[in-house]
Structure formats: structure tokens, C-alpha cells
């Protein structure tokens, strides 16, 4: 309707997952019961409902389309299975359930993947002490995390943080085919005579359903 | 905004001594290598010293060498230089520069200059 | 001490024209460690102090117009202003920071009016 606001969408259930794994998305709070003997299911794109999933006196059918090989029902019909969860699957789902009562129940699916153990790469050959400036000490790589993960630098097992004129961390990401991350770190700094036997690493710290995680990568001098 | 403001300048007799002055604001003072560098009337530019961030490295130009002494306080986020014996020729426009590292080293921040005149 | 020789010493133009300003070095300012020349350029226009226009004998200081353009390497530079303008009436230094021990400057070229 022409001038009508926007209703805004209630706050959604929260589904996280791990790419390659089963998300379960379920059509109301866990603790809600009854008989959903008709539910349709869409996915919600670019503020359109596209319709993947239907349940009709307990029986479900698959929509054609993007996501028609990888639903099914689980358990309940209430619970909508979802199979080989990929980065592309980070969307807004909706129920509609139509019986017992008529009701709407957002689902919002979150994605993860461990980035693999990061590689590093020193950069400088010597220390050259008469430079005012700062040089790449070191480059670390992450590769197909999601989402990205947050890079840390250590400098002899401390961590190192951005410092005017003394530390630039350079930090860039591209997105891979399958949606997955692949970090790129260049830490540059200003090195010192002292720096000669200095231990420089990489940290990568991210995120699963299980909880947060980290990966180091090897040191170099 | 980054901002060097020199003072100190002025009129002084041969063999007399002044100092110079060069407050920094708008950046982190204490993490950058600092410059003082001169300019004779109506002539080129001239390094004159250059201090390390923490103070402790000083380097200055032959010439000068014994007589004048580059130093900074990074509490009060300023840079010095001590002119001692002063002769005819050291007369100029004294800047203070800023050395940014990510630059290499290059002085990509000046102040506005103090005039130091050494005449009798 | 690496000693900068930069011509010409002056130079007169009109607006609008294409100019260069060259400057030679007694010894390389391309740095191995780092793939880089050490060479700067500075604008310094009437009672101001100088203003940093080029670093790394061809990366443009934030903010300076595009028709800057810095060239070359080892020991040979150039400083090409491409459409001069009113506002580029100054004397343009070149500086070497290879040896930051002891920084050293081209004796300046003067842009003026024809």
C-alpha cells in the first residue's frame, strides 16, 4: 500500500551451523507445541519471500529451485532440516504456519568454518637499523574461514597493536567461490637493533557454535 | 590536524648561544623521528640534525657538529635545538619537520619557521 | 655526503604549459631492501615553509593534484608538472633520505611567469 511503513521484522530465532553440516530450523521456540500440520517455509531475499518448502497434513514438499536437494523434514514438522550448510546459506528464513493458528516465525541461519592453521612468511632479510621507516616484517594467510577471522600479531610471544609511525597492520580478505574467507595480513614496523632475534607470529581467533577458537601459525626471525 | 609551531628565533651576537623551540600537536610526538632543518636568505635547504623517537639516536649535520645539540621532551611534546658559538653563516629560517615512517623517513610535516639573524 | 645536482635553476612558463624539472644523484637512492628510491620532492612557495608533494620518487603525498607526476630510479629523476598553474609558481626541491644520516637537497629550481 502506497505510504505504508515497513513492519519490521520480529526478532528472529537465532540457528548457528558449521559449513557442511545439518542446520535445524525450527518453525517457532522449541518449547512451543502443537500440531504444524501446514507450514510453509520461505527464504527471504532482498525483502522478497521466495517459497522453498511446503508441509501439508504432515507431509512435506520441496520447491524447485536453489535450495530443493538439500531440505527435508526432521522429527517433527515443524523442523525444517537443512544439509551441506555453505556461506551462501547466511540468510533470514520464514515460517508461516497456518495450523493450529496463523502465525509468522523468523529464523536467521549463521555460517561457520575454522579457518586452516595460517601460513607466514617473513619478509625482511636483515635488520637495517639507519631506517626511520617502517618495513613488511612479516606476511600471515588464513585461509577458508568463516566468517572472516580477527588476526592477531606477536612480537616474542606479546601481542602487537597498531602504533602511529611504529606498527601498521595491513589487513585484507577475499572471498573464495564457496563463500569462505581467505585472510591476508602484512604487519609492517619500525625495526631496532634489538629486533635482530625476534620472534614475529600470527594468531587467527574465530568463531564455531562451539564456542571461540584460535590457530597460530609457526614463528619467524 | 598536525601542527609544528617553532619559536625561539631572533637577533644574537656571534659566539652567543639560543636555543629553538618546536611544539607538536595533532599526531603521537613520541613515536616519530624529528628534524630541524635551515634555509639562508635567499638560499636552498639545509639539514641541520635529526633526533630518533625515543630520543636516544641524534644525528647532525658536520658543520654544526659540537655546537649545536638537537633534543626533544616527549612529555611536553617538543622538539629543541641548542645553538651554541653561532657564527654569521648560521643565520636562517630554522623548521622543524616531522619524519613519517610509513613515508621511509621522509619529512612530510613542516612548521612555519623561526628567523635566527647572527650578526653584531 | 650523496650530492643532489637539480636543473635547470630556473625556469620560465606560461599556464597551461607541460614542464620538468630533473635532479641527479652522486650515488643510487634505490634501496635492495626495500625496492625503493629514496627521493622526495618539495613545493616551497613565497614566505611559506616547504610543502612534501612526492615520496618514493613517485607516490604522490595525500591531497597534491594528479598533474604532479614524479619519475625515475637509481640515480635519475624528474619532476613533470603537466598544465601549469598559477598556484605551482615556487621553487621545487629535490632531497635524497637514502642516507637519513645526512639528508641532503638540490639546490631548487625557480618556477616563474614568462
Known amino acids: 500500500v502506497p505510504g505504508e511503513e515497513k513492519q519490521p521484522v520480529p526478532t528472529p530465532d537465532l540457528v548457528e551451523a558449521e559449513v557442511g553440516s545439518t542446520a535445524l530450523l525450527k518453525c517457532g521456540p522449541s518449547r512451543a507445541s502443537g500440531n504444524f500440520s501446514q507450514v510453509d517455509w520461505f527464504l527471504i531475499h532482498k525483502e522478497r519471500q521466495i517459497l522453498i518448502f511446503r508441509v501439508h497434513q504432515g507431509k512435506g514438499q520441496r520447491e524447485p529451485g536453489e535450495y530443493e536437494h538439500r531440505l527435508s523434514l526432521q522429527d517433527s514438522v515443524a523442523t525444517l532440516a537443512l544439509s551441506h550448510v555453505t556461506p551462501h546459506d547466511e540468510r533470514m528464513f520464514l515460517c508461516k504456519s497456518k495450523r493450529p493458528r496463523l502465525q509468522d516465525h523468523y529464523v536467521e541461519l549463521q555460517v561457520f568454518k575454522a579457518p586452516e592453521e595460517p601460513t607466514i612468511q617473513a619478509n625482511v632479510v636483515g635488520i637495517h637499523v639507519d631506517r626511520q621507516e617502517l618495513r613488511e616484517v612479516a606476511t600471515c594467510v588464513g585461509r577458508n574461514g568463516y566468517p572472516i577471522p580477527q588476526v592477531l600479531w606477536y612480537k616474542n610471544s606479546l601481542p602487537l597493536q597498531e602504533e602511529e609511525n611504529r606498527v601498521h597492520i595491513q589487513s585484507s580478505q577475499i572471498v573464495e567461490s564457496s563463500g569462505l574467507y581467505t585472510l591476508k595480513s602484512v604487519l609492517s614496523a619500525r625495526l631496532v637493533k634489538e629486533d635482530k632475534d625476534a620472534q614475529f607470529y600470527c594468531e587467527l581467533s574465530y568463531r564455531l557454535p562451539s564456542g571461540n577458537h584460535m590457530k597460530e601459525s609457526k614463528e619467524v626471525t | 590536524e598536525v601542527r609544528l609551531v617553532e619559536s625561539g628565533g631572533g637577533l644574537v651576537q656571534p659566539g652567543k648561544s639560543m636555543k629553538l623551540s618546536c611544539v607538536a600537536s595533532?599526531?603521537?610526538?613520541?613515536?616519530?623521528?624529528m628534524s630541524w632543518v635551515r634555509q639562508a636568505p635567499a638560499k636552498g635547504l639545509e639539514w641541520v640534525a635529526s633526533?630518533?623517537?625515543?630520543?636516544?639516536?641524534?644525528f647532525c649535520r658536520d658543520l654544526v657538529k659540537g655546537r649545536f645539540t638537537i633534543s626533544r621532551d616527549n612529555a611536553k611534546s617538543t622538539l629543541y635545538l641548542q645553538m651554541d658559538s653561532l657564527r654569521p653563516e648560521d643565520t636562517a629560517t630554522y623548521y622543524c619537520?616531522?619524519?613519517?615512517?610509513?613515508?621511509?623517513?621522509?619529512?612530510?610535516?613542516w612548521g612555519q619557521g623561526t628567523s635566527v639573524t647572527v650578526s653584531s | 655526503d650523496i650530492v643532489m645536482t637539480q636543473s635547470p635553476s630556473s625556469l620560465a612558463v606560461s599556464a597551461g604549459e607541460t614542464v620538468s624539472i630533473h635532479c641527479k644523484s652522486s650515488?643510487?637512492?634505490?634501496?635492495?631492501?626495500?625496492?625503493?628510491?629514496?627521493l622526495a620532492w618539495f613545493q616551497q612557495k613565497p614566505g611559506q615553509s616547504p610543502k612534501l608533494l612526492i615520496f618514493w620518487a613517485s607516490t604522490r603525498q595525500s591531497g597534491v593534484p594528479d598533474r604532479f607526476i614524479g619519475r625515475g630510479s637509481g640515480t635519475d629523476f624528474t619532476l613533470t608538472i603537466s598544465g601549469v598553474q598559477a598556484e605551482d609558481l615556487a621553487i621545487y626541491y629535490c632531497q635524497q633520505y637514502y642516507d637519513t644520516l645526512t639528508d641532503t637537497f638540490g639546490a631548487g629550481t625557480k618556477l616563474e611567469l614568462k
Open positions: 633526533i630518533s623517537d625515543g630520543g636516544g639516536d641524534t
Open positions: 650515488q643510487s637512492l634505490l634501496y635492495s631492501g626495500t625496492q625503493k628510491n629514496y
Open positions: 619537520a616531522r619524519r613519517g615512517a610509513a613515508m621511509g623517513g621522509v619529512m612530510d610535516a
Open positions: 595533532g599526531f603521537k610526538f613520541s613515536n616519530y623521528y
